[in-house]
């Protein structure tokens, strides 16, 4: 609806009256409107609302509103709609970031790696290797490395030390009278041969001579995965290598205990870039195409101390 009344705070603009050639000073129209009729010696300027598909951000003296930008190209979504006061703004949906005028999925940090820096709509996730004492057992674009389960605090012992990719497996020593096998339904995380694990305090070991193996594993490339929920854990890079171990060495009869420890229990830290979280030593790399500084190929450990 045309508006004729000018606010006291509205600025002015100059307009040349075509009929008389006279330079007139008119009141500007408010944002979201345009000048449908300029002022004359005897009348105020007339403002009209911007038609659909157009806008003006500020008070103005223009005769036509600006056209809004084109609809957001897939896969972008509208951050701001086209309205009388605002132009359409496009952004990348959750789990993606703007790259070369389109949206690319956030890098998925592979197993053994955690998120060092969260991704945003304009910046990719940055991954880091889990450091000593931490691990990541699922590919994720939101989760940091998690600290190993503290078996001792649960009055249990470590029957399988954690790696960058697996948590400690806790268990109890059976009584001499009965030998118990792992209870059904509990997962004993397999540790591939030739895998380096993080050092675990010796006080948590019961089986003697059980050192983790060390060597390289080839990196496995996984497809990108979109994740919209941020895990609250922070990475901690504190892993250390242990001596060689005969992976096939049999353990004494130990009972495996379910940890029931979700990522929300974990606190991870980043120190030197790796002071974030780290876990086992198996090589894997963040899944992504050529991207700035994301780890590729080998395992990378930064001095980080992050906590979940």
């Amino acid at each position: 609806q045309p508006e004729q009344k000018a606010s006291n705070l509205i600025g002015t603009y100059r307009h040349v009256d075509r009929a008389t050639g006279q330079v007139l000073t008119c009141d500007k129209c408010p944002a979201g409107t345009y000048v449908s009729e300029h002022c004359t010696n005897t009348s105020l300027r007339v403002c009209s609302s911007c038609p659909v598909g157009t806008f003006t951000r500020h008070e103005n003296g223009i005769e036509k509103c600006h056209d809004c930008s084109q609809p957001c190209p897939w896969p972008m979504i509208e951050k701001l709609p086209c309205a009388a006061l605002t132009d359409r703004e496009c952004t990348c949906p959750p789990g993606m970031f703007q790259s070369n005028a389109t949206c690319a999925p956030h890098t998925v940090c592979p197993v053994g790696w955690g998120v060092r820096k969260k991704g945003t709509e304009t910046e990719d996730v940055r991954c880091k290797q889990c450091a000593r004492g931490t691990f990541s057992d699922v590919p994720s674009s939101v989760m940091k490395c998690k600290a190993y389960t503290d078996c001792l605090s649960q009055n249990l012992v470590v029957i399988k030390p954690g790696t960058k990719e697996t948590d400690n497996v806790c268990g109890t020593l059976p009584s001499f009278s009965s030998s118990t096998s792992p209870s059904p339904g509990t997962a004993i995380f397999p540790r591939p041969e030739h895998m380096e694990t993080h050092e675990v305090p010796s006080s948590t070991y019961v089986p003697k001579g059980m050192n983790s193996t060390e060597s390289n594993s080839s990196a496995s490339v996984r497809p990108k995965v979109l994740s919209s929920i941020q895990e609250g854990t922070v990475p901690d890079n504190t892993s250390s290598a242990r001596g060689k171990e005969d992976v096939n060495k049999t353990l004494p009869n130990l009972q495996v205990v379910n940890h029931q420890q979700g990522p929300h229990h974990r606190h991870i830290l980043k120190l030197l870039p790796s002071m974030e979280a780290t876990g086992g030593e198996k090589s894997s790399t963040p899944i992504k195409g050529p991207k700035r500084g994301h780890p590729r190929q080998n395992l990378h450990k930064h001095f980080d101390i992050n906590e979940h």
């Epitope: 450091a131 390289n216 504190t238 979280a277 990378h300």
Partner: antibody, heavy 115, light 110 residues
């Protein structure tokens, strides 16, 4: 046994350059993030730079950004720190450290920047 | 000035309990793991505590670490003369996108 041995330190004039090396042994070097941490005489520890295991990503303290370059040669199990445009305040013992947790450190090499 | 604040010194007699504090903020200690390092006179630092409260093998159980909120602490029970050293806390800082160290605490055994 994990061992880290730094070398390359010495006396250099302001504006000069030095290249530090850290020879690693006793572990799978290519699997670890590595870092440089320094300690000025009588002062505390200051993180300088870190590099991923593959060398794919590097991080630098603001105080050395643009002047220092961290790199590694996994085939030689060696970490490097190229230091250019050295200043008096860069005088320190430079340590290399393994892993994000800095679980093992070298014995350090002294860099003195003085005219 | 360090992002992490430690008392410059702490002392105790043999057998006593000494605690060193390390104060930070949400962007560092509050959201990340804390590490502690011991530096004996004239030697390189050594990892003492990782992921807030874990000890590497070889570190006596007299040393314990804890974290609460934006602060962490290192406790030494049954203080011994060989514990005389500088102790540093460290963590990652999300805002700086870098590791940070405390200024260090010199522990003296009286």
């Amino acid at each position: 046994e994990v061992q880290l041995l730094e070398s390359g330190g010495g006396l250099v004039q302001p504006g000069g350059s030095l290249r530090l090396s850290c020879a690693a042994s006793g572990f799978t070097f290519s699997n670890y993030e590595m870092s440089w941490v320094r300690q000025a005489p009588g002062k505390g520890l200051e993180w300088v730079s870190s590099i991923y295991s593959s060398g794919g990503e590097t991080l630098y303290a603001d105080s050395v950004k643009g002047r220092f370059t961290i790199s590694r040669d996994n085939s030689k199990n060696t970490l490097y720190l190229q230091m250019n445009s050295l200043r008096a305040e860069d005088t320190a013992v430079y340590y290399c450290a393994r892993d994000g947790a800095a679980d093992y450190w070298g014995q350090g090499t002294l860099v003195t920047v003085s005219s | 000035q360090s992002e992490l604040t430690q008392p410059p010194s702490a002392s105790g007699t043999p057998g006593q309990w000494v605690t060193i504090s390390c104060s930070g903020s949400t962007s560092n200690i509050g959201n990340n793991y804390v590490y502690w390092y011991q530096q004996l006179p004239g030697t390189a630092p050594k990892l003492l505590i990782y992921t807030n409260n874990q000890r590497p093998s070889g570190v006596p159980d007299r040393f314990s670490g804890s974290k609460s909120g934006t602060s962490a602490s290192l406790a030494i029970s049954g203080l011994r003369s060989e514990d005389e050293a500088d102790y540093y806390c460290a963590t990652w800082d999300d805002s700086l996108y870098a590791p940070v160290f405390g200024g260090g605490t010199k522990v003296t055994v009286l």
